[in-house]
Interface confidence: medium
């Protein structure tokens, strides 16, 4: 309820500024606070043209309608004229705003409501949640008139949400039984005949299912790729592409490599056998390190536990990192820092999977809404690091990139689906106590570990808070941060956001009622989400830090690229480009 004083102030303001014209000083006298006066004055000057009649001025000051350019508007419309939801003013995704509550404090840039802070001639507007549309005006009622600032013109293709087609129209089993005649990739490239010399040479080392008939140059899925049917294409040796079929949304079972949809009581304690690690990649193309992956020189190899790994193992039996802690030296020897050459800056995390391949998030390299499209020559990777800023002589290794490979179906336009990229190093990196590769999961490991409630670990040098300024507290860490987080049930992940979640993602984090906190944050992207297998004591990278709405917010979770589901793509790229050296002239 309003206090008596507030009522008096409101009365003073009405007498001074509504019944007659007032100056800033008079408004300040009535409001007795410079912040409140600034906010009021911004509205009052915006309503300059609506000083009479009095009820029109009152409506204008109330801000539920637009007067003139609509700089007075303070209503709650948060959809643009074409029906796109507005981006939060405080958010940097999908667009980095140049206008915010710091640059325009009087503009009332609350939530994602339409506003006109820069006096745009088309009236109130907002940044949009569509990565392909930076900003757009909104349709706002005009004060005192039966019209709107701009007419609503909904997009003809309707909602951006893909409605599932009738089941009989979709292709089951990721196209493994597909017998159709599609022979062109999603990028419009014609397929090579499977019987061509080039395709035969590439197929020679592949583990193809003999039941899949490789007919002419038709798209097929002979290797059980989770992405669906594909074919080889002309170009650089080994180039391939996926083909566009409408796949059925199938229930996620153990086959897809996780147990995040069903209520699973598969307790790990019942499995006592310590499984031997089976190598998956061809060392000729992958490089060395797989046989020894996930066994850290300063921990597993010395029979030492790190200080929080027991928390992970216990979760199987019964935090930019926010709310994390300093990592121990050698705790995450696969951690890689993706570093921009000029201007020099930390871009993202990444992970070492062999002596010549590094895994990261595609959005670290390519994100058009931010004008981000890095090439090999723009970047360096720094491996073996602990300190964020210091050059760690004799410990870290700095490597140049030979080639970047981004998933061909990475979806930056909508939801960062398939947010994954591989980077091939120009020269193999030497392993040490501080530099060692992580394992990539096989189907059984993914099925047994990727379960709701089981904890994984995220590491990175990203921000310690969602919003920070250099003079308020610690914004960025001095050393690598670590946080352990529980995997969350897929339905809970889906319910926590309006963004379309796919099977190529999973989410993790504490629920509001769990009493613990932690999340990845800006700068941690591309880094690893790892889990320790209780069967063979090795660390596996189950996820890649992909996206989140803010950092460590209640009811929001961090989203991670599902590495196992995209492992076939990883294998294809490595098999086909691991031996080829690309000389850039």
């Amino acid at each position: 309820a309003n206090t008596f004083l507030e009522e008096v102030r409101k009365g003073n303001l009405e007498r001074e500024c509504v019944e007659e014209t007032c100056s800033y000083e008079e408004a300040f006298e009535a409001l007795e606070s410079s912040t409140a006066t600034d906010v009021f004055w911004a509205k009052y000057t915006a309503c300059e043209t609506a000083r009479t009649p009095r009820d029109k001025l009152a409506a204008c000051l109330e801000g539920n309608c637009a007067e003139g350019l609509g700089t007075n508007y303070r209503g709650h419309v948060n959809i643009t004229r074409s029906g796109i939801e507005c981006q939060l003013w405080r958010s940097r995704y999908p667009h980095k705003p140049e206008i915010n509550s710091t640059t325009h404090p009087g503009a009332d840039l609350q939530e994602n409501f339409c506003r006109n802070p820069d006096s745009s001639t088309t009236g109130p507007w907002c940044y949009t949640t569509d990565p392909t549309v930076r900003r757009q005006e909104c349709s706002i009622p005009v004060c005192g008139q039966d019209q709107v600032t701009v007419a609503m013109t909904p997009r003809s293709e309707g909602s951006s949400v893909n409605l599932s087609p009738p089941l009989e129209q979709c292709v089951p089993d990721r196209g493994q039984q597909y017998q159709g005649r599609l022979a062109v990739t999603t990028h419009g490239l014609p397929c090579l005949a499977w019987a061509s010399a080039q395709a035969k040479a590439l197929s020679k080392h592949q583990d193809f299912n003999s039941a899949v008939q490789l007919v002419e140059n038709f798209c097929r899925n002979p290797d059980g790729d989770e992405e669906g049917v594909w074919c080889y294409v002309a170009g650089k040796p080994g180039d391939f592409g996926y083909c566009d079929l409408n796949y059925c949304e199938e229930a996620v079972e153990e086959e897809t490599g996780d147990g995040l949809d069903e209520d699973s009581d598969r307790a790990i304690e019942g499995r006592t056998a310590t499984s031997e690690y089976q190598t998956f990649f061809n060392p000729r193309t992958f490089g060395s390190g797989e046989a020894d992956c996930g066994l850290r020189p300063l921990f597993e190899k010395k029979s030492l536990e790190d200080k929080t790994e027991r928390e992970l193992l216990e979760s199987y039996i019964d935090g930019r990192i926010v709310e994390g802690s300093d990592a121990e030296i050698g705790m995450s020897p696969w951690q890689v820092m993706l570093f921009r050459k000029s201007p020099q800056e930390l871009l993202c995390g990444a992970s070492l999977i062999s002596d010549r391949w590094v895994l990261t998030a595609a959005h670290c390299l390519l994100y058009p809404p931010w004008d981000k499209n890095f090439t090999e020559n723009d970047l360096l990777v720094r491996i073996g690091k602990h300190s964020r800023t210091r050059y760690e002589r004799n410990i870290e290794k700095i490597s140049m990139l030979e080639k970047i490979y981004i998933h061909p179906r990475y979806n930056w336009r909508e939801n960062l689906d398939r947010d994954i990229a591989l980077m091939k190093l120009k020269k193999p990196v030497a392993f040490s106590d501080y530099i060692h590769p992580v394992c990539l999961p096989d189907r059984e490991t993914a099925a047994s570990l990727l379960q709701a409630g089981y904890k994984g670990r995220v590491t990175g040098w990203g921000n310690l808070k969602e919003t920070w300024t250099a003079n308020v507290g610690k914004g960025q860490p001095s050393v690598l941060q670590v946080v352990n987080l529980p995997i969350v049930e897929r339905p809970v992940c889906k319910d926590s956001t309006r963004i379309r979640i796919t099977d190529n993602m999973f989410c993790a984090g504490y629920k509001p009622d769990e009493g613990k906190r932690g999340d990845a944050c800006e700068g941690d992207s591309g880094g690893p989400f790892v889990m320790k297998s209780p069967f063979n004591n090795r660390w596996y990278q189950m996820g890649i830090v992909s996206w989140g709405e803010g950092c460590d917010r209640d009811g929001k979770y961090g989203f991670y690229t599902h590495v196992f589901r995209l492992k076939k793509w990883i294998q294809k790229v490595i098999d086909q480009f691991g031996e080829h050296h690309h000389h850039h002239h």
Partner: antibody, heavy 121, light 107 residues
Framework: EVQLVESGGGLVQPGGSLRLSCAAS????????MAWVRQAPGKGLEWVSN????????YYLDSLKSRFTISRDNSKNTLYLQMNSLKAEDTAVYYC??????????????WGQGTTVTVSS | DIQMTQSPSSLSASVGDRVTITCKAS??????LAWYQQKPGKAPRLIIS???SLETGVPSRFSGSGSGKDYTLTISSLQPEDFATYYC?????????FGGGTKVEIK
């Protein structure tokens, strides 16, 4: 040869102050966490304080936190321990020690010869 | 704070003897244990870290074992230069704490 040489010890009255120094050579000082460990006459070893490689994080024995300050100057390859409000029970040989792995393992693989601090009136 | 209890506090032995020193932590320290050797008037010398890893240059007659709260330092065949005081140290949680020491004397 890896070497640590402490200096700055001596006789001081209760309530007085001393600043110990430790000059490092033979290794890249700025890569290593460093520590001070003390040993009272005829007694065992007691960890006093640690500092990380760039000096941004410090750790102390709780009972000494308000009186002792560890710092380092990487440009001079020198570690310091500022001791204020000294008490008789601070009498000990103070050793400067280097951390084992260039980081936070808190095992000390290289030690100085020690410098003696005597607090007495 | 984690208490480290070393036993015995002193022992007498002869050259060639097998010597065992134990160190008990007040809680699990997950193998984060180091052993040091100190001779009179000298600084300590690290001989074992991670409960079992012998430091470079340390003779193989020294060995470490144990897990959880209980750890052991064994000298398989005592040599004249091994007569000294031995300390254990935990580095699982701050403050880092040492045992009270075990003085190995000539019988």
């Amino acid at each position: 040869e890896v070497q640590l040489v402490e200096s700055g010890g001596g006789l001081v009255q209760p309530g007085g102050s001393l600043r110990l120094s430790c000059a490092a050579s033979g290794f890249t000082f700025s890569d290593y966490y460093m520590a001070w460990v003390r040993q009272a006459p005829g007694k065992g070893l007691e960890w006093v304080s640690n500092i990380n490689s760039d000096g941004s994080s410090t750790y102390y024995l709780d009972s000494l936190k308000s009186r002792f300050t560890i710092s380092r100057d990487n440009s001079k390859n020198t570690l310091y321990l500022q001791m204020n409000s000294l008490k008789a029970e601070d009498t000990a040989v103070y050793y400067c020690a280097r951390d084992h792995y260039m980081g936070n393992s808190y095992v000390f693989d290289t030690w100085g010869q020690g410098t003696t601090v005597t607090v007495s009136s | 704070d984690i208490q480290m209890t070393q036993s015995p506090s002193s022992l007498s032995a002869s050259v060639g003897d097998r010597v065992t020193i134990t160190c008990k932590a007040s809680e699990d320290i997950y193998n984060r244990l180091a052993w040091y050797q100190q001779k009179p008037g000298k600084a300590p010398r690290l001989i074992i870290s991670g409960a079992t890893s012998l430091e470079t240059g340390v003779p193989s007659r020294f060995s470490g074992s144990g897990s959880g709260k209980d750890y052991t330092l064994t000298i398989s065949s005592l040599q004249p230069e091994d007569f000294a005081t031995y300390y254990c140290q935990q580095y699982w949680s701050t403050p880092w704490t040492f045992g009270g020491g075990t003085k190995v004397e000539i019988k």
